[in-house]
């Protein structure tokens, strides 16, 4: 797959951390947010500290997504829920792909047809309701340096 030029981690060796990012969802302009209690949603506030995310390359094209302030890892659960866990599990890895429109998608490595996605209201979308071509799965990585 193509690799993100700015926001992706796919071109970097395993264990490599890039600068913190904010993931901007095309569907409504929400930034992906990881709360300290493990909840995941979207917010339209660039100053929210919980949108600062660390993308770490596990292997080429595979990343984990950690909320810097929450100190938790984004996870796709077997029922399609998105939440953030304190420890890295096999549910915390995602295939990162740069799509032709320059947005990234993050597809679960464990549940391979499910994507990280935000609804138009800012709530997360169940993995089981996601699929290719949806605006909800498209994310633009942006710098989170402050």
């Amino acid at each position: 797959p193509a690799l993100p030029e700015d926001g992706g981690s796919g071109a970097f060796p395993p264990g490599h951390f890039k600068d913190p990012k904010r993931l901007y969802c095309k569907n409504g302009g929400f930034f992906l947010r990881i709360h300290p209690d493990g909840r995941v949603d979207g917010v339209r506030e660039k100053s929210d500290p919980h949108i600062k995310l660390q993308l770490q390359a596990e292997e080429r094209g595979v990343v984990s997504i950690k909320g810097v302030c929450a100190n938790r890892y984004l996870a796709m659960k077997e029922d399609g829920r998105l939440l953030a866990s304190k420890c890295v599990t096999d549910e915390c890895f995602f295939f990162e792909r740069l799509e032709s429109n320059n947005y990234n998608t993050y597809r679960s490595r464990k549940y391979t047809s499910w994507y990280v996605a935000l609804k138009r209201t800012g709530q997360y979308k169940l993995g089981s309701k996601t699929g290719p071509g949806q605006k909800a799965i498209l994310f633009l990585p942006m710098s989170a340096k402050s």
């Epitope: 901007y24 095309k26 409504g28 302009g29 339209r44 506030e45 660039k46 100053s47 320059n102 138009r120 209201t121 633009l140 942006m142 710098s143 989170a144 340096k145 402050s146």
Partner: antibody, heavy 121, light 107 residues
Framework: EVQLVQSGAEVKKPGSSVKVSCKAS????????INWVRQAPGQGLEWIGY????????KYNEKFKGRATITSDKSTSTAYMELSSLRSEDTAVYYC??????????????WGQGTTVTVSS | DIQMTQSPSSLSASVGDRVTITCKAS??????VGWYQQKPGKAPKLLIY???NRYSGVPSRFSGSGSGTDFTLTISSLQPEDFATYYC?????????FGQGTKVEIK
Amino acid sequence: EVQLVQSGAEVKKPGSSVKVSCKASGYTFTNYVINWVRQAPGQGLEWIGYNDPYNDVSKYNEKFKGRATITSDKSTSTAYMELSSLRSEDTAVYYCAKEGGGKYVYAMDSWGQGTTVTVSS
Amino acid sequence: DIQMTQSPSSLSASVGDRVTITCKASQSVSSDVGWYQQKPGKAPKLLIYSGSNRYSGVPSRFSGSGSGTDFTLTISSLQPEDFATYYCQQDYYSPWTFGQGTKVEIK
């Protein structure tokens, strides 16, 4: 081509209300937030708030909370900004502006022509 | 609220001059600053977004730089159509706030 066409100039008495409209065309109205910004004569720009036409959810500058009401009508692709309890300091040009979205994020990339509101007794 | 302080408030320049306008935020706003151009009786127009990115169709003589608290708009070679008022704006913290404007006049 994106167009935002605003309603005409208004002259209002202190204490009354004004409702300015902004009709959008050339894009999918529910995909982008509409901001409202005002400019007093000879002064700078001041953000009032925005409305998301998708679910009619609004966010306000605290300064205008309780006095400004920003709404939208999906069926006519029109955004509205109503300001109540008008005072002379509210005399200004009021602009609607669409957010850019995508790589432009929240930058305002298309603006209405402005509506002059004069508050005078 | 975040204060955006522009300087100078006005300047006189000639066609072909290099013009620099600065904007200082009262606290860090990351790189989330835009620049707008406004001519008398007209609505503002977006020039620069996210600190340093030129908006579609904006001439290359306009450039933006900076992050944190200090931002700059540069016009490399002033053209007759560039005489206008320029505003910086931050959208990092709510409420979004603008600078007071810099009027660029003909010398």
